[in-house]
């Protein structure tokens, strides 16, 4: 005969464990139901009554099956240098990531605690290593024969144009200037860009108009200009 299915609460067989989505209550000494994500235990089980679950209160969440007495508080609203890539719901915490042009200087378990602006390489310097979601731009001086005339977190050093007759020789921050006769070889006009890290935007559309100039409390304060490293500018 098949074993009878026990309904919570029930006393487990000696040496056995409770089933999936159940927990052992030390006080009642019974296997009791866990609460589903988005809920918490309002009333713990007894020998005769199962766990009573309730929905998480506003701005709190539980992500897992649980028997916690209170849901966890969602993180602070994202600061102005961040985008909300996951909204606070009953089942998930808010996740803030850095907006384009910024990188995460101090990460947390999910998302970013503190964003900082990507370093901009000043004229005479180009991007040696582009910024990522978690690392800053690295600048390098433009080697002989190359230049960068921009202050940018994406522009690399570009080769000088080659002139038949040079009017003004190029340097690290300026292209060569040719005499009216056209150069034999010229780079395509316009700066060469490196791809910027892209922050993934949330699929969740929140009805609130998110204040665009609202730095959040807690640790989510926007960082000021980064101290200029060699060949970089803090602007």
């Amino acid at each position: 005969l098949p074993a009878q299915v026990a309904f919570t609460p029930y006393a487990p067989e000696p040496g056995s464990t409770c089933r999936l989505r159940e927990y052992y209550d030390q006080t009642a000494q019974m296997c009791c139901s866990k609460c589903s994500p988005g809920q918490h235990a309002k009333v713990f089980c007894t020998k005769t009554s199962d766990t009573v679950c309730d929905s998480c209160e506003d701005s709190t969440y539980t992500q897992l099956w649980n028997w916690v007495p209170e849901c966890l508080s969602c993180g602070s609203r994202c600061s102005s240098d961040q985008v909300e890539t996951q909204a606070c719901t009953r089942e998930q915490n808010r996740i803030c990531t850095c907006r384009p042009g910024w990188y995460c200087a101090l990460s947390k378990q999910e998302g970013c605690r503190l964003c900082a602006p990507l370093r901009k390489c000043r004229p005479g310097f180009g991007v040696a290593r582009p910024g990522t979601e978690t690392s800053d731009v690295v600048c390098k001086p433009c080697a002989p024969g190359t230049f960068s005339n921009t202050t940018s977190s994406t522009d690399i050093c570009r080769p000088h144009q080659i002139c038949n007759v040079v009017a003004i020789p190029g340097n690290a921050s300026m292209d060569a200037v040719c005499t009216s006769t056209s150069p034999t070889r010229s780079m395509a006009p316009g700066a060469v860009h490196l791809p910027q890290p892209v922050s993934t935007r949330s699929q969740h559309t929140q009805p609130t108009p998110e204040p665009s100039t609202a730095p959040s409390t807690s640790f989510l304060l926007p960082m000021g200009p980064s101290p200029p490293a060699e060949g970089s500018t803090g602007d």
């Epitope: 506003d58 808010r94 009805p207 609130t208």
Partner: antibody, heavy 120, light 108 residues
Framework: QVQLVQSGAEVKKPGASVKVSCKAS????????MHWVRQAPGQGLEWIGR????????KHDPKFQDRVTMTSDTSTNTVYMELSSLRSEDTAVYYC?????????????WGQGTLVTVSS | DIQMTQSPSSLSASVGDRVTITCTAS???????LHWYQQKPGSSPKLWIY???NLPSGVPSRFSGSGSGTDFTLTISSLQPEDFATYYC?????????FGQGTKVEIK
């Protein structure tokens, strides 16, 4: 754009009931709460209660325990607040306001208010 | 219930003055759950500062908020004619959610 439009002014006798409506537009009623707040003439703001329009779950100040009923009609995006056993001290402007889930109760949009006068 | 007490209840100030309004809670309130509203006569309240120190879009940067625990402050760095109004603090930390009695900022 987000709008909360409330029903018109009411004059009621003591002991009667009043039902105020608040029609929401410009946003999804999911993941928001609708609150009711009142303001007696020349007085401050007093929170009455709130409803989750998606589930109908309500919470209110215990002082209104037996007199307030909050309901929602998701088909018309309208919430209602009914106050019974009216007395003269219930004379006030009644506001509906919304707070998105996860915004720690910040009420970012308010209705224009409904004046309820209780007079014999 | 958490009682919210604002001081002063009213104040008279001139354009350009620095104005500070305080809000004291009868028990501790998490900073995320403390908000301020501005209300002008005949109008509905407007969310003015959320989560203690954050300004919704459209609120001038001369407004700031600070505080923690039981003591919170709204400051106007340089009072402007359009700032004359009543300001309410509001806690959403524990139900029933409560408002301060309001601080009326009047022209001197």
């Amino acid at each position: 754009q987000v709008q909360l439009v409330q029903s018109g002014a009411e004059v009621k006798k003591p002991g009667a009931s009043v039902k105020v409506s608040c029609k929401a537009s410009g946003f999804n009623n999911k993941d928001i709460y609708m609150h009711w707040v009142r303001q007696a003439p020349g007085q401050g703001l007093e929170w009455i209660g709130r409803i989750d329009p998606a589930t109908g779950n309500t919470k209110h100040d215990p002082k209104f325990q037996d007199r307030v009923t909050m309901t929602s009609d998701t088909s018309t995006n309208t919430v209602y607040m009914e106050l019974s056993s009216l007395r003269s001290e219930d004379t006030a402007v009644y506001y509906c306001a919304r707070s998105p889930y996860g915004d720690f109760g910040a009420m970012d949009y308010w209705g224009q208010g409904t004046l309820v006068t209780v007079s014999s | 219930d958490i009682q919210m007490t604002q001081s002063p209840s009213s104040l008279s100030a001139s354009v350009g003055d620095r104005v500070t309004i305080t809000c004291t809670a009868s028990s501790s309130v998490s900073s995320n759950y403390l908000h301020w509203y501005q209300q002008k006569p005949g109008s509905s309240p407007k969310l003015w500062i959320y989560s203690t120190s954050n300004l919704p879009s459209g609120v001038p940067s001369r407004f700031s908020g600070s505080g923690s625990g039981t003591d919170f402050t709204l400051t106007i760095s340089s009072l402007q004619p359009e700032d004359f109004a009543t300001y309410y603090c509001h806690q959403y930390h524990r139900s029933p959610w409560t408002f301060g009695q309001g601080t009326k900022v009047e022209i001197k």
